[in-house]
Interface confidence: medium
Amino acid sequence: KFSKQSWGLENEALIVRCPRQGKPSYTVDWYYSQTNKSIPTQERNRVFASGQLLKFLPAAVADSGIYTCIVRSPTFNRTGYANVTIYKKQSDCNVPDYLMYSTVSGSEKNSKIYCPTIDLYNWTAPLEWFKNCQALQGSRYRAHKSFLVIDNVMTEDAGDYTCKFIHNENGANYSVTATRSFTVKDEQGFSLFPVIGAPAQNEIKEVEIGKNANLTCSACFGKGTQFLAAVLWQLNGTKITDFGEPRIQQEEGQNQSFSNGLACLDMVLRIADVKEEDLLLQYDCLALNLHGLRRHTVRLSRKNPIDHHS
């Protein structure tokens, strides 16, 4: 019951806490169980005891074994056991199961991955984070103190995450790595090939010369949070910003969630002071996500003046 598994890699720091807890004032003695030999407390030793902590600075494969800790108080003694295994470093990228800490699950709402055992060490931020041995890059990853946050989590984010940090002991630095699996919980969301609700394909929009006109591009992309989804307008196949006509601007609308729970986006194209030449342009509403791109084309036509005599 009062035994705990601990593991580490050779040439890295490993710090183990006694499974039996006591007040800080209680003394803790450590022994190597096989020989019943006392572990020294002098910090000059590579392996030494420091109260409730047993420190391997750094660890060696030969350190593997069972260590006994005895918490001594004026009225009782409590005994615990630490089963320590030190492994050789792997030459390849794979982290074997026996080096893995507990798996954590995340979702779009909660995607924190804590660096395991880090609270035992004297470390300074920031940590380095790796996924499947690759250093994490990009703005979706935010390292904060002892944990990593992933923005807009998706199923592809599942994998093995390794934190790496430096433990400092009396001015000497020791590397520590720890790996855990991260799984992504399905929140019943899904993504579809974009569906453009407006405008209709090849729609003709009537406008009045000299007046303002608005075109709305509206599309739905699936249910739940969408990692990559965008709607935009193009003029004659060119981005609005590159077209160079200040009268024609696009403005992002609000996220819409319809009664069926679909995730939809709007983009409004505003044309100020409609001119004759605007009728010659091709207006493309584009909706794109990870599945692909859908395009609906609109053309403008002159609205005929109302005939009051008919």
Epitope: P126, E128, Q137, S139, R142
Partner: antibody, heavy 116, light 107 residues
Framework: EVQLLESGGGLVQPGGSLRLSCAAS????????MSWVRQAPGKGLEWVSS????????YYADSVKGRFTISRDNSKNTLYLQMNSLRAEDTAVYYC?????????WGQGTLVTVSS | DIQMTQSPSSLSASVGDRVTITCRAS??????LSWYQQKPGKAPKLLIY???SLQSGVPSRFSGSGSGTDFTLTISSLQPEDFATYYC?????????FGQGTKVEIK
């Protein structure tokens, strides 16, 4: 047009409080992280605080932790910074910015002066 | 915390000059680096994100490069409107930190 507009700055005595607001328009505010960055007179830029789109994650610089509180109201498209126990060294122009790992756009800034 | 060190602190250059500003991180930050331009009395303006991506609307004479710890902002041909202070910023880890700034002045 994507725009951020700060307000709420002013002169306050040491130990006093201020609440800054940042009104966002032209983008889907509720989808983005937001941050506050400040700049003391004649000095460089200093990150102050960040908040995730749904307020699940909130980070502070050590220099303001325990004194400043960042919050947001997605229904009002507004970001806030509640500043308590203000010190002379908090005197700065405070900018709000949309945070995508990089800051863009920035508001025009609001000046906070802490002086007796 | 990650320290960002810019060099030089200031430089004098003429219109048409090629200008290079460097930024060094105290530890590897991947490509999580941005560059900003700030003019007196104005808010900073994003130029480059993820080390080398040019922000929409920014002239192509601005470019960024680098990865890990060493990064560079280059202005291929300095224009009158480019005289300003430039900052780098890392977003690898909180607290997000900025360089101390590089002031580009007219020679």
């Amino acid at each position: 047009e994507v725009q951020l507009l700060e307000s709420g700055g002013g002169l306050v005595q040491p130990g006093g409080s201020l609440r800054l607001s940042c009104a966002a328009s032209g983008f889907t505010f509720s989808s983005y992280w937001m941050s506050w960055v400040r700049q003391a007179p004649g000095k460089g830029l200093e990150w102050v605080s960040s908040i995730s789109s749904s307020s699940s994650y909130i980070y502070y610089a050590d220099s303001v932790k325990g004194r400043f509180t960042i919050s947001r109201d997605n229904s009002k498209n507004t970001l806030y910074l509640q500043m308590n126990s203000l010190r002379a060294e908090d005197t700065a122009v405070y900018y709000c910015a949309r945070d995508q790992g990089w800051f863009d756009p920035w508001g025009q800034g609001t000046l906070v002066t802490v002086s007796s | 915390d990650i320290q960002m060190t810019q060099s030089p602190s200031s430089l004098s250059a003429s219109v048409g000059d090629r200008v290079t500003i460097t930024c060094r991180a105290s530890r590897a930050i991947g490509n999580n680096l941005s560059w900003y331009q700030q003019k007196p009395g104005k808010a900073p303006k994003l130029l480059i994100y993820t080390a080398s991506s040019l922000q929409s609307g920014v002239p192509s004479r601005f470019s960024g490069s680098g990865s890990g710890t060493d990064f560079t902002l280059t202005i291929s041909s300095l224009q009158p409107e480019d005289f300003a202070t430039y900052y780098c910023q890392q977003s690898y880890s909180t607290p997000y930190t900025f360089g101390q700034g590089t002031k580009v002045e007219i020679k």
